[in-house]
Protein backbone atom coordinates (compact mmCIF):
# COMPACT_ATOMS: atom_id res chain seq x y z
CA UNK A 1 0.00 0.00 0.00
CA UNK A 2 1.43 3.47 -0.88
CA UNK A 3 2.77 5.50 2.05
CA UNK A 4 0.27 8.41 1.58
CA UNK A 5 -2.59 5.90 1.82
CA UNK A 6 -1.15 4.51 5.05
CA UNK A 7 -0.85 8.08 6.36
CA UNK A 8 -4.50 8.72 5.68
CA UNK A 9 -5.57 5.41 7.25
CA UNK A 10 -3.52 6.28 10.34
CA UNK A 11 -5.08 9.74 10.45
CA UNK A 12 -8.59 8.29 10.13
CA UNK A 13 -7.86 5.75 12.84
CA UNK A 14 -6.67 8.53 15.16
CA UNK A 15 -9.63 10.79 14.40
CA UNK A 16 -12.26 8.04 14.71
CA UNK A 17 -11.01 6.57 18.01
CA UNK A 18 -13.72 6.12 20.64
CA UNK A 19 -14.13 9.17 22.89
CA UNK A 20 -13.31 7.01 25.92
CA UNK A 21 -9.79 6.43 24.57
CA UNK A 22 -9.03 10.15 24.61
CA UNK A 23 -7.62 11.74 27.78
CA UNK A 24 -8.79 15.11 29.13
CA UNK A 25 -8.20 18.11 26.87
CA UNK A 26 -9.94 16.72 23.77
CA UNK A 27 -9.72 19.88 21.60
CA UNK A 28 -5.98 20.23 22.33
CA UNK A 29 -5.36 16.59 21.42
CA UNK A 30 -7.38 16.89 18.23
CA UNK A 31 -5.42 20.01 17.32
CA UNK A 32 -2.16 18.19 17.99
CA UNK A 33 -3.24 15.24 15.83
CA UNK A 34 -4.26 17.64 13.08
CA UNK A 35 -0.83 19.31 13.21
CA UNK A 36 0.93 15.95 13.23
CA UNK A 37 -1.00 14.90 10.13
CA UNK A 38 -0.24 18.22 8.48
CA UNK A 39 3.50 17.92 9.09
CA UNK A 40 3.50 14.25 8.10
CA UNK A 41 1.79 15.13 4.84
CA UNK A 42 4.19 17.99 4.14
CA UNK A 43 7.13 15.66 4.72
CA UNK A 44 5.64 13.12 2.31
CA UNK A 45 5.19 15.81 -0.33
CA UNK A 46 8.71 17.13 0.23
CA UNK A 47 10.23 13.66 0.00
CA UNK A 48 8.37 12.87 -3.22
CA UNK A 49 9.53 16.08 -4.87
CA UNK A 50 13.02 15.65 -3.45
CA UNK A 51 13.16 12.28 -5.24
CA UNK A 52 12.05 13.89 -8.48
CA UNK A 53 14.70 16.60 -8.22
CA UNK A 54 17.40 14.05 -7.41
CA UNK A 55 16.47 11.90 -10.41
CA UNK A 56 16.41 15.00 -12.62
CA UNK A 57 19.82 16.00 -11.32
CA UNK A 58 21.25 12.57 -12.11
CA UNK A 59 19.95 12.83 -15.64
CA UNK A 60 21.51 16.30 -16.02
CA UNK A 61 24.94 15.09 -14.91
CA UNK A 62 24.88 12.36 -17.56
CA UNK A 63 23.68 14.85 -20.18
CA UNK A 64 26.57 17.19 -19.44
CA UNK A 65 29.09 14.41 -20.10
CA UNK A 66 27.99 13.78 -23.69
CA UNK A 67 26.46 16.23 -26.15
CA UNK A 68 25.31 13.26 -28.21
CA UNK A 69 22.99 12.16 -25.40
CA UNK A 70 21.24 15.53 -25.02
CA UNK A 71 18.19 14.70 -27.10
CA UNK A 72 17.31 11.50 -25.25
CA UNK A 73 18.08 13.12 -21.90
CA UNK A 74 15.68 15.99 -22.55
CA UNK A 75 12.96 13.44 -23.37
CA UNK A 76 13.65 11.59 -20.12
CA UNK A 77 13.76 14.82 -18.13
CA UNK A 78 10.42 15.78 -19.57
CA UNK A 79 9.01 12.44 -18.47
CA UNK A 80 10.51 12.84 -14.99
CA UNK A 81 9.03 16.34 -14.56
CA UNK A 82 5.70 15.03 -15.85
CA UNK A 83 5.80 12.08 -13.41
CA UNK A 84 6.82 14.43 -10.60
CA UNK A 85 3.90 16.73 -11.33
CA UNK A 86 1.52 13.76 -11.37
CA UNK A 87 2.91 12.55 -8.04
CA UNK A 88 2.59 16.03 -6.54
CA UNK A 89 -1.00 16.34 -7.74
CA UNK A 90 -1.89 12.92 -6.31
CA UNK A 91 -0.40 13.87 -2.95
CA UNK A 92 -2.16 17.23 -2.93
CA UNK A 93 -5.48 15.52 -3.68
CA UNK A 94 -5.06 13.18 -0.71
CA UNK A 95 -3.69 15.88 1.61
CA UNK A 96 -5.87 18.94 1.02
CA UNK A 97 -4.80 20.41 4.36
CA UNK A 98 -1.20 20.66 3.16
CA UNK A 99 -1.26 24.23 1.84
CA UNK A 100 2.04 25.39 3.33
CA UNK A 101 4.43 24.93 0.42
CA UNK A 102 2.11 24.66 -2.61
CA UNK A 103 2.77 28.13 -4.05
CA UNK A 104 6.52 27.80 -3.66
CA UNK A 105 6.59 24.31 -5.14
CA UNK A 106 4.51 25.47 -8.11
CA UNK A 107 6.97 28.27 -8.80
CA UNK A 108 9.86 25.82 -8.55
CA UNK A 109 8.19 23.42 -10.99
CA UNK A 110 7.49 26.28 -13.43
CA UNK A 111 11.06 27.55 -13.22
CA UNK A 112 12.44 24.06 -13.88
CA UNK A 113 10.01 23.52 -16.76
CA UNK A 114 10.97 26.91 -18.24
CA UNK A 115 14.69 26.09 -18.23
CA UNK A 116 13.98 22.61 -19.59
CA UNK A 117 12.11 24.28 -22.44
CA UNK A 118 15.18 26.36 -23.21
CA UNK A 119 17.33 23.22 -23.21
CA UNK A 120 14.92 21.42 -25.55
CA UNK A 121 14.90 24.40 -27.94
CA UNK A 122 18.69 24.62 -27.91
CA UNK A 123 18.88 20.89 -28.57
CA UNK A 124 16.64 21.22 -31.63
CA UNK A 125 18.79 24.00 -33.07
CA UNK A 126 21.91 21.95 -32.34
CA UNK A 127 20.54 18.82 -34.01
CA UNK A 128 19.49 20.79 -37.12
CA UNK A 129 22.93 22.40 -37.30
CA UNK A 130 24.67 19.03 -37.07
CA UNK A 131 22.54 17.68 -39.92
CA UNK A 132 23.28 20.70 -42.14
CA UNK A 133 26.97 20.48 -41.31
CA UNK A 134 27.08 16.79 -42.22
CA UNK A 135 25.47 17.48 -45.60
CA UNK A 136 27.90 20.34 -46.33
CA UNK A 137 30.96 18.34 -45.32
CA UNK A 138 29.81 15.45 -47.51
CA UNK A 139 29.70 17.73 -50.54
CA UNK A 140 33.12 19.15 -49.48
CA UNK A 141 31.84 22.72 -49.54
CA UNK A 142 34.26 23.66 -46.77
CA UNK A 143 33.91 27.47 -46.61
CA UNK A 144 30.29 27.58 -45.38
CA UNK A 145 30.92 24.41 -43.38
CA UNK A 146 33.48 26.18 -41.21
CA UNK A 147 31.11 29.10 -40.65
CA UNK A 148 28.35 26.63 -39.80
CA UNK A 149 30.71 24.83 -37.44
CA UNK A 150 31.41 28.08 -35.54
CA UNK A 151 27.68 28.69 -35.14
CA UNK A 152 27.27 25.08 -34.01
CA UNK A 153 30.03 25.51 -31.43
CA UNK A 154 28.38 28.68 -30.10
CA UNK A 155 25.07 26.81 -29.72
CA UNK A 156 26.80 23.91 -27.99
CA UNK A 157 28.48 26.32 -25.56
CA UNK A 158 25.19 28.05 -24.85
CA UNK A 159 23.50 24.72 -24.24
CA UNK A 160 26.27 23.62 -21.88
CA UNK A 161 25.77 26.84 -19.93
CA UNK A 162 22.00 26.32 -19.76
CA UNK A 163 22.50 22.77 -18.48
CA UNK A 164 25.08 24.00 -15.96
CA UNK A 165 22.61 26.63 -14.71
CA UNK A 166 19.80 24.07 -14.58
CA UNK A 167 21.93 21.63 -12.60
CA UNK A 168 22.66 24.37 -10.06
CA UNK A 169 18.98 25.32 -9.92
CA UNK A 170 17.96 21.70 -9.27
CA UNK A 171 20.67 21.30 -6.61
CA UNK A 172 19.53 24.43 -4.76
CA UNK A 173 15.91 23.24 -4.96
CA UNK A 174 16.96 19.89 -3.51
CA UNK A 175 18.78 21.53 -0.61
CA UNK A 176 15.85 23.82 0.14
CA UNK A 177 13.57 20.76 0.21
CA UNK A 178 16.00 19.02 2.57
CA UNK A 179 16.01 22.11 4.81
CA UNK A 180 12.20 22.24 4.86
CA UNK A 181 12.02 18.56 5.79
CA UNK A 182 14.66 19.01 8.50
CA UNK A 183 12.74 21.93 10.04
CA UNK A 184 9.41 20.09 9.89
CA UNK A 185 10.92 17.03 11.58
CA UNK A 186 12.21 19.25 14.39
CA UNK A 187 8.76 20.84 14.84
CA UNK A 188 7.09 17.43 14.75
CA UNK A 189 9.50 16.09 17.40
CA UNK A 190 8.74 19.09 19.62
CA UNK A 191 5.03 18.47 19.24
CA UNK A 192 5.46 14.80 20.21
CA UNK A 193 7.60 15.78 23.20
CA UNK A 194 5.03 18.36 24.30
CA UNK A 195 2.24 15.77 23.99
CA UNK A 196 3.99 13.28 26.30
CA UNK A 197 2.66 13.11 29.88
CA UNK A 198 4.82 14.93 32.43
Amino acid sequence: MPVPALCLLWALAMVTRPASAAPMGGPELAQHEELTLLFHGTLQLGQALNGVYRTTEGRLTKARNSLGLYGRTIELLGQEVSRGRDAAQELRASLLETQMEEDILQLQAEATAEVLGEVAQAQKVLRDSVQRLEVQLRSAWLGPAYREFEVLKAHADKQSHILWALTGHVQRQRREMVAQQHRLRQIQERLHTAALPA
Epitope: R54, I104, W164, A165, T167, G168, H169, V170, Q171, R172, R175, E176, V178, A179, Q180, H182, R183
Partner: antibody, heavy 120, light 107 residues
Framework: EVQLVESGGGLVQPGGSLRLSCAAS????????MNWVRQAPGKGLEWVSY????????TYADFLKGRFTISRDNAKNSLFLQMNSLRDEDTAVYYC?????????????WGQGTLVTVSS | DIQMTQSPSSLSASVGDRVTITCQAS??????LNWFQQKPGKAPKLLIF???NLETGVPSRFSGSGSGTDFTFTISSLQPEDIATYFC?????????FGQGTKLEIK
Protein backbone atom coordinates in the same frame (compact mmCIF):
# COMPACT_ATOMS: atom_id res chain seq x y z
CA GLU B 1 35.98 38.83 -5.94
CA VAL B 2 33.71 37.05 -3.47
CA GLN B 3 34.08 38.47 0.03
CA LEU B 4 32.35 37.50 3.26
CA VAL B 5 33.23 39.47 6.40
CA GLU B 6 31.85 38.41 9.78
CA SER B 7 31.55 40.77 12.75
CA GLY B 8 29.80 41.01 16.12
CA GLY B 9 31.81 38.43 18.05
CA GLY B 10 33.24 39.07 21.49
CA LEU B 11 33.16 38.12 25.15
CA VAL B 12 29.74 37.49 26.68
CA GLN B 13 28.54 35.99 29.96
CA PRO B 14 26.54 32.73 30.06
CA GLY B 15 22.87 33.52 29.44
CA GLY B 16 23.76 36.61 27.42
CA SER B 17 23.08 37.47 23.78
CA LEU B 18 25.08 38.44 20.70
CA ARG B 19 24.16 39.31 17.11
CA LEU B 20 26.63 38.25 14.44
CA SER B 21 26.68 39.86 11.01
CA CYS B 22 28.15 38.74 7.71
CA ALA B 23 28.67 41.43 5.04
CA ALA B 24 28.75 40.01 1.51
CA SER B 25 30.26 41.59 -1.60
CA UNK B 26 31.53 40.64 -5.05
CA UNK B 27 28.47 38.57 -6.00
CA UNK B 28 24.67 38.74 -6.30
CA UNK B 29 23.79 38.01 -2.68
CA UNK B 30 20.09 37.26 -3.21
CA UNK B 31 20.92 34.39 -5.61
CA UNK B 32 22.70 32.36 -2.95
CA UNK B 33 21.77 30.29 0.07
CA MET B 34 23.89 30.93 3.15
CA ASN B 35 24.99 28.95 6.20
CA TRP B 36 26.65 29.51 9.56
CA VAL B 37 29.31 27.00 10.66
CA ARG B 38 31.29 27.11 13.90
CA GLN B 39 34.55 25.70 15.21
CA ALA B 40 35.33 25.44 18.94
CA PRO B 41 39.00 26.11 19.82
CA GLY B 42 41.14 23.15 18.72
CA LYS B 43 38.06 21.21 17.59
CA GLY B 44 36.34 20.20 14.36
CA LEU B 45 33.75 22.02 12.25
CA GLU B 46 30.06 22.03 13.18
CA TRP B 47 27.16 23.20 11.01
CA VAL B 48 24.86 25.68 12.79
CA SER B 49 22.18 27.03 10.47
CA TYR B 50 20.92 27.36 6.88
CA UNK B 51 18.88 30.06 5.11
CA UNK B 52 17.60 29.90 1.53
CA UNK B 53 18.33 32.66 -1.00
CA UNK B 54 14.91 34.25 -0.46
CA UNK B 55 15.03 33.82 3.32
CA UNK B 56 11.77 31.83 3.25
CA UNK B 57 13.36 28.58 4.44
CA UNK B 58 15.54 28.39 7.55
CA THR B 59 16.70 25.52 9.69
CA TYR B 60 19.06 24.90 12.61
CA ALA B 61 21.21 22.25 14.24
CA ASP B 62 19.25 20.26 16.84
CA PHE B 63 21.62 21.16 19.67
CA LEU B 64 20.63 24.84 19.47
CA LYS B 65 17.16 24.11 20.96
CA GLY B 66 15.67 27.29 19.50
CA ARG B 67 18.27 29.65 20.99
CA PHE B 68 19.65 31.01 17.67
CA THR B 69 17.86 32.77 14.80
CA ILE B 70 19.25 33.15 11.28
CA SER B 71 18.05 35.96 9.00
CA ARG B 72 19.17 37.96 5.99
CA ASP B 73 18.67 41.39 4.44
CA ASN B 74 19.06 40.97 0.69
CA ALA B 75 18.79 44.73 0.11
CA LYS B 76 21.86 45.25 2.31
CA ASN B 77 23.77 42.10 1.27
CA SER B 78 23.87 40.97 4.88
CA LEU B 79 23.42 37.75 6.83
CA PHE B 80 22.74 37.63 10.58
CA LEU B 81 22.80 35.19 13.48
CA GLN B 82 20.99 36.24 16.65
CA MET B 83 22.34 34.16 19.53
CA ASN B 84 20.41 34.09 22.83
CA SER B 85 20.82 32.18 26.10
CA LEU B 86 24.47 31.61 25.30
CA ARG B 87 26.33 28.76 27.02
CA ASP B 88 30.01 27.99 27.62
CA GLU B 89 29.86 25.33 24.88
CA ASP B 90 28.88 27.99 22.30
CA THR B 91 32.43 29.38 22.50
CA ALA B 92 33.79 29.08 18.95
CA VAL B 93 34.84 30.87 15.80
CA TYR B 94 31.67 31.44 13.76
CA TYR B 95 31.95 31.42 9.96
CA CYS B 96 29.39 32.43 7.36
CA UNK B 97 29.57 30.39 4.16
CA UNK B 98 28.04 30.71 0.70
CA UNK B 99 27.09 28.03 -1.82
CA UNK B 100 29.10 27.31 -4.97
CA UNK B 101 28.72 29.49 -8.06
CA UNK B 102 27.46 26.40 -9.91
CA UNK B 103 24.88 25.73 -7.18
CA UNK B 104 26.37 22.34 -6.35
CA UNK B 105 28.11 22.60 -2.97
CA UNK B 106 26.48 24.54 -0.11
CA UNK B 107 29.69 25.51 1.75
CA UNK B 108 32.10 26.80 -0.88
CA UNK B 109 33.18 30.32 0.09
CA TRP B 110 33.87 31.16 3.73
CA GLY B 111 34.47 34.35 5.67
CA GLN B 112 37.47 34.75 7.97
CA GLY B 113 35.31 34.05 11.04
CA THR B 114 34.46 35.93 14.23
CA LEU B 115 35.31 34.61 17.70
CA VAL B 116 32.54 34.28 20.28
CA THR B 117 33.71 33.62 23.84
CA VAL B 118 31.12 32.71 26.46
CA SER B 119 32.59 32.92 29.94
CA SER B 120 31.81 34.30 33.38
CA ASP C 1 22.46 12.33 11.39
CA ILE C 2 25.04 11.12 8.88
CA GLN C 3 28.37 10.29 10.53
CA MET C 4 31.57 10.96 8.61
CA THR C 5 34.55 8.83 9.64
CA GLN C 6 37.84 10.20 8.40
CA SER C 7 41.19 8.43 8.58
CA PRO C 8 43.93 8.73 9.52
CA SER C 9 43.56 11.45 12.15
CA SER C 10 47.17 12.50 11.58
CA LEU C 11 49.74 11.77 8.93
CA SER C 12 53.45 12.45 8.48
CA ALA C 13 54.91 12.39 4.97
CA SER C 14 57.86 13.68 2.99
CA VAL C 15 57.87 16.29 0.22
CA GLY C 16 57.06 14.55 -3.07
CA ASP C 17 55.15 11.70 -1.39
CA ARG C 18 51.72 10.57 -2.52
CA VAL C 19 49.26 11.15 0.33
CA THR C 20 45.85 9.51 0.66
CA ILE C 21 43.04 10.33 3.13
CA THR C 22 39.79 8.36 3.31
CA CYS C 23 36.32 9.33 4.43
CA GLN C 24 33.44 6.95 5.09
CA ALA C 25 29.80 8.01 5.42
CA SER C 26 27.39 6.13 7.69
CA UNK C 27 24.87 6.01 4.81
CA UNK C 28 24.78 6.60 1.07
CA UNK C 29 25.52 10.26 0.28
CA UNK C 30 25.65 9.90 -3.52
CA UNK C 31 28.55 12.18 -4.56
CA UNK C 32 27.58 15.02 -2.22
CA LEU C 33 31.01 15.42 -0.62
CA ASN C 34 33.43 18.33 -0.16
CA TRP C 35 37.11 18.25 0.80
CA PHE C 36 38.51 21.28 2.65
CA GLN C 37 41.99 22.42 3.60
CA GLN C 38 42.40 24.49 6.78
CA LYS C 39 45.56 26.18 7.95
CA PRO C 40 45.96 27.43 11.56
CA GLY C 41 43.98 30.61 12.23
CA LYS C 42 42.39 30.54 8.78
CA ALA C 43 38.97 29.64 7.37
CA PRO C 44 38.53 26.31 5.56
CA LYS C 45 39.26 26.45 1.82
CA LEU C 46 37.29 24.30 -0.63
CA LEU C 47 39.51 22.01 -2.71
CA ILE C 48 37.12 19.37 -4.10
CA PHE C 49 33.32 19.44 -4.48
CA UNK C 50 30.87 16.79 -5.68
CA UNK C 51 33.45 14.18 -4.54
CA UNK C 52 35.75 14.59 -7.54
CA ASN C 53 35.46 18.11 -9.03
CA LEU C 54 38.54 20.28 -8.54
CA GLU C 55 37.65 23.80 -7.43
CA THR C 56 38.87 26.60 -9.73
CA GLY C 57 42.40 27.72 -8.90
CA VAL C 58 43.27 24.60 -6.88
CA PRO C 59 46.47 22.82 -8.03
CA SER C 60 45.92 19.61 -10.01
CA ARG C 61 47.99 17.56 -7.54
CA PHE C 62 44.81 17.46 -5.42
CA SER C 63 42.13 14.97 -6.45
CA GLY C 64 39.08 13.21 -5.06
CA SER C 65 37.17 10.05 -5.90
CA GLY C 66 34.38 7.85 -4.63
CA SER C 67 30.60 7.69 -4.47
CA GLY C 68 28.02 6.27 -2.09
CA THR C 69 29.75 5.74 1.26
CA ASP C 70 33.50 5.50 0.53
CA PHE C 71 35.61 8.45 -0.59
CA THR C 72 39.30 9.14 -1.12
CA PHE C 73 41.30 12.37 -1.22
CA THR C 74 44.78 12.29 -2.76
CA ILE C 75 47.74 14.64 -3.00
CA SER C 76 49.85 13.18 -5.81
CA SER C 77 53.09 14.91 -4.82
CA LEU C 78 53.18 16.58 -1.39
CA GLN C 79 54.45 20.17 -1.28
CA PRO C 80 55.59 22.12 1.83
CA GLU C 81 52.61 24.50 1.50
CA ASP C 82 50.20 21.54 1.79
CA ILE C 83 50.82 21.30 5.55
CA ALA C 84 47.34 21.77 7.01
CA THR C 85 44.32 19.93 8.38
CA TYR C 86 41.99 18.37 5.82
CA PHE C 87 38.26 17.80 6.35
CA CYS C 88 35.59 15.94 4.41
CA UNK C 89 31.97 17.14 4.60
CA UNK C 90 28.68 15.69 3.35
CA UNK C 91 25.76 17.71 1.98
CA UNK C 92 23.38 14.89 1.13
CA UNK C 93 21.26 15.74 4.16
CA UNK C 94 20.92 18.15 7.04
CA UNK C 95 22.59 18.59 9.39
CA UNK C 96 25.68 18.93 7.22
CA UNK C 97 28.39 16.92 8.94
CA PHE C 98 32.18 16.90 8.81
CA GLY C 99 34.90 14.33 9.29
CA GLN C 100 37.03 14.90 12.40
CA GLY C 101 39.97 16.05 10.28
CA THR C 102 43.38 14.75 9.21
CA LYS C 103 46.40 16.74 10.39
CA LEU C 104 49.14 16.51 7.76
CA GLU C 105 52.76 17.08 8.77
CA ILE C 106 56.08 17.01 6.94
CA LYS C 107 58.65 14.40 7.97
Amino acid sequence: EVQLVESGGGLVQPGGSLRLSCAASGFTFNNHEMNWVRQAPGKGLEWVSYISSSGNTVTYADFLKGRFTISRDNAKNSLFLQMNSLRDEDTAVYYCARDHLSGTSPLSYWGQGTLVTVSS
Amino acid sequence: DIQMTQSPSSLSASVGDRVTITCQASQDINNYLNWFQQKPGKAPKLLIFDASNLETGVPSRFSGSGSGTDFTFTISSLQPEDIATYFCQQYENLPYTFGQGTKLEIK
